[in-house]
């Protein structure tokens, strides 16, 4: 009821706390001499449910029967209306609609660690919409009982603050929770348990790992546990993996040997504990230990490729390239690569350690038979060397793959296809597809990429180091014993018309014709593989269509003759470049007048 109602009263029957669905009677009555002046018959009492008028009556009192109230609190306010004045509040009352508590379900108790305290949880059931008090009771041997009350509105957890000890681990304890509110009470089913049932060990701590003789095959995990722990489970995984390896151990006494760890791998280890084979629950997982396993000598062999370049009549340049071993093959940090170059007939050998690079270039005589061996070394040893005989990779014309094509395949991929060589295709032992960015200067510093393909394959998808709008020189090699044949093609993953045309840098006259020279378009403006150049010319100040000459693109070409110009006529000349996607804008314009005699 609203405190200190001077003008009248509001009463609620049977109670201001009711069960959902019940009916209540609300009475509003004026106190003596609190009605309208002059005529009490003019008293108009109005009953509001919050701000909505639900009933009115002329006189000293009003009765109203109310049904269908919702869960929660509803406020009723009684007001008096007199002629020629505002309504004034008389009094008010709240009605609280709720339900009796449901039986608490799934009561379960736990003691965290041997030194912890007993705490229980349960499911409350549906909200009562009323203040509901929960009392937890625990009874044990020798008529011992403990009780704890919960003052929290949504109570589903209580800690007794007592510790069960392992003196009699089979002794029974019984817990029960009772919910009480203004509309009733309900108790859970009793939950009976022993010390072993409810004690959940603390997670193991102080986890360490030791590798005997710095070897991954002799690894022991150590940890500390509470005294009564009987079982442990270990889980471990490489730090970059989502899948755990799981091991269960009994009576481990804080140590376990692990036999299947990979070398030079960061692992995450966690341990959990339990007091009894089939009673109680597992502890939480321990905090993670992260540790890197020791290195082992590399396995596998390097993938090695090479390029030969003619220098002069007596010397050639050999560039060797190799790919990093995979992490599982390297089995440690690769400290250096060992390259051995040997002349097979004379037996001369030269060895060099390479650090920080995966390539090596040297100059050797053009005579003799040369071989190289490359291996990778970490702190524990070296991989088996990859041996390669240096040969002329494109010498055997009959081994050259046929009908090589290169087509864009989605984003930043190129599909290279070919036909086997004319010479007995079964002689091919493997194909190598090699690609590098096309640089007009034939720059040998441009990184080289390659992949190996089985002899029965006639296509390869290249995607490593492929950029959009860049032209690649692609070669397909067919290798057979100490012979090789090759074919090449230009290809790009994505193209558009070049951003600019070639820049004409000189026009010279030679015997009645002219020679046009130009600068290559910068690589970043070519926007793919160039197919043609076009040279346009027309008479100065003429409105006629220009004539043109189309030249197939060749990497090193940067001049071309034209012999159809008339003497003593001034011409304007310009150039464009074309990819498969279209033609560039004009390059610069140059004027030229041929001085030669007219026919």
């Amino acid at each position: 009821k609203i405190d200190a109602c001077k003008r009248g009263d509001v009463t609620v029957k049977p109670s201001h706390v009711i069960l959902l669905g019940s009916t209540v009677n609300i009475t509003c009555s004026l106190k003596p001499r609190q009605g309208c002046f002059h005529y009490s018959r003019r008293n108009k009492l109005i009953l509001y449910k919050f701000d909505r008028r639900i009933n009115f009556h002329h006189g000293h009192s009003l009765n109203s029967q109310v049904t269908g109230l919702p869960l929660g609190t509803t406020l009723f306010v009684c007001k008096l209306a007199c002629i020629n004045s505002d309504e004034i509040q008389i009094c008010g009352a709240e009605i609280f609609v709720g339900v009796a508590p449901e039986q608490p379900q799934n009561l379960s108790c736990i003691q965290k660690g041997e030194q912890g305290t007993v705490a229980c949880t349960w499911e409350r059931g549906r909200d009562t919409h009323l203040y509901t008090e929960y009392t937890l009771q625990l009874s044990g041997p020798k008529n011992l009982t403990w009780q704890k009350q919960c003052k929290d509105i949504y109570c589903d957890y209580l800690d007794f603050g007592i510790n069960l000890t392992p003196e009699s681990p089979e002794s029974n304890f019984t817990a029960k929770v009772t919910a009480v509110n203004s509309l009733g009470s309900s108790s859970s089913l009793p939950s009976t348990f022993t010390f072993l049932d409810i004690v959940r060990p603390l997670p193991p701590w102080d986890i360490r790992i030791k590798f005997q003789k710095a070897s991954v095959s002799r690894c022991t995990l150590y940890w500390r546990d509470e005294g009564l722990v009987l079982l442990n489970r270990l889980r471990y995984r490489p730090s970059n993996s989502r899948l755990w390896n799981m091991v269960n151990v009994t009576k481990a006494k804080g140590r376990h040997d692990l036999l299947d760890l990979k070398p030079f791998t960061e692992y995450e280890f966690q341990i959990s504990s339990k007091l009894h084979l089939y009673k109680g629950s597992w502890s939480d997982w321990s905090e993670s230990l992260r540790a890197q396993t020791p290195e082992e000598e590399p396995t596998g062999m390097l993938d090695v490729w090479y390029m030969k370049r003619h220098i002069d009549y007596s010397r050639q340049q050999i560039s060797l390239f190799w790919k990093n071993l995979s992490v599982s093959e390297a089995r440690g940090k690769i400290l250096h690569y060992q390259v051995t170059l040997q002349e097979l007939t004379g037996g001369k050998a030269m060895t060099q350690n390479i650090t920080g690079h995966t390539s090596w270039t040297t100059v050797i005589p053009r005579t003799g038979n040369w071989a190289v061996a490359v291996s990778a070394a970490n702190s524990k040893g070296s991989s088996l060397p990859t041996r390669i005989n240096i040969m002329n990779l494109c010498e055997a014309g009959l081994l050259a793959p046929r009908q090589v094509s290169a087509n864009s395949e989605g984003m930043d991929n190129i599909l290279v296809t070919w036909q086997p060589p004319r010479k007995d295709p079964s002689a091919v032992q493997e194909y190598v597809v090699e690609w590098r960015e096309l640089h007009p200067g034939g720059d040998t510093q441009v990184p080289l990429n390659w992949l190996r393909s089985r002899p029965y394959n006639v296509s390869a998808l290249i995607s490593e180091n492929i950029k959009s709008y860049i032209c690649y020189e692609i070669r397909v090699y067919a290798l057979s014993g100490d012979q090789g044949g090759c074919s090449s093609i230009l290809g790009n993953s994505k193209h558009k018309a070049p951003l600019s045309g070639p820049h004409i840098n000189a026009i010279t006259e030679e015997k009645g014709s002219i020679l046009i020279s130009w600068n290559s378009i910068p690589v970043q403006e070519q926007m793919g593989c160039l197919l043609h150049y076009r040279i346009y010319w027309k008479e100065r100040d003429s409105n006629s269509q220009p004539q043109l000459c189309e030249i197939p693109y060749r990497v090193s070409q940067n001049s071309h003759p034209i012999n159809s110009l008339q003497p003593r006529v001034t011409y304007v000349l310009w150039m464009t470049a074309l990819t498969a996607a279209g033609e560039s804008s004009h390059g610069n314009e140059r004027e030229f007048c041929l001085q030669g005699k007219a026919n």
Partner: nanobody
């Protein structure tokens, strides 16, 4: 034990605005309505506005359209935003938390509307 603490009252000119706050301690805030009442000198306390536990607002006719009640369950606070204030709104404003075990009242905050 629940305690309620109002704040935000003061002197304001007619037509002005004030925002009252009422902060509760104790966990029962979330299942009950919260109410604002006011008491002018010589009068009894009268109901101004209520907000249910689910956030539905209700207002007395004298303040409807000018006052707005709201609640922030995380902060256990109820607010009364009072706009277009009139001299007849002058009173001590109380917040109340009604429960079936009894009502909890704040100590009140004075609002004076005067030019």
């Amino acid at each position: 034990q629940v305690q309620l603490q109002e704040s935000g009252g003061g002197l304001v000119q007619p037509g002005g605005s004030l925002r009252l706050s009422c902060t509760a301690s104790g966990s029962i805030f979330s299942i009950y309505n919260m109410d604002w009442y006011r008491q002018a000198p010589g009068n009894q306390r009268e109901w101004v506005a209520s907000i249910t536990s689910s956030g539905d607002p209700y207002y007395d006719a004298s303040v409807k359209g000018r006052f707005t009640i709201s609640r922030d369950s995380a902060k256990m606070t109820v607010y009364l935003q009072m706009n277009s204030l009139k001299p007849e709104d002058t009173a001590v404003y109380y917040c109340k938390l009604p429960t079936e075990k009894g009502n909890y009242w704040g100590q009140g905050t004075q609002v004076t509307v005067s030019s």
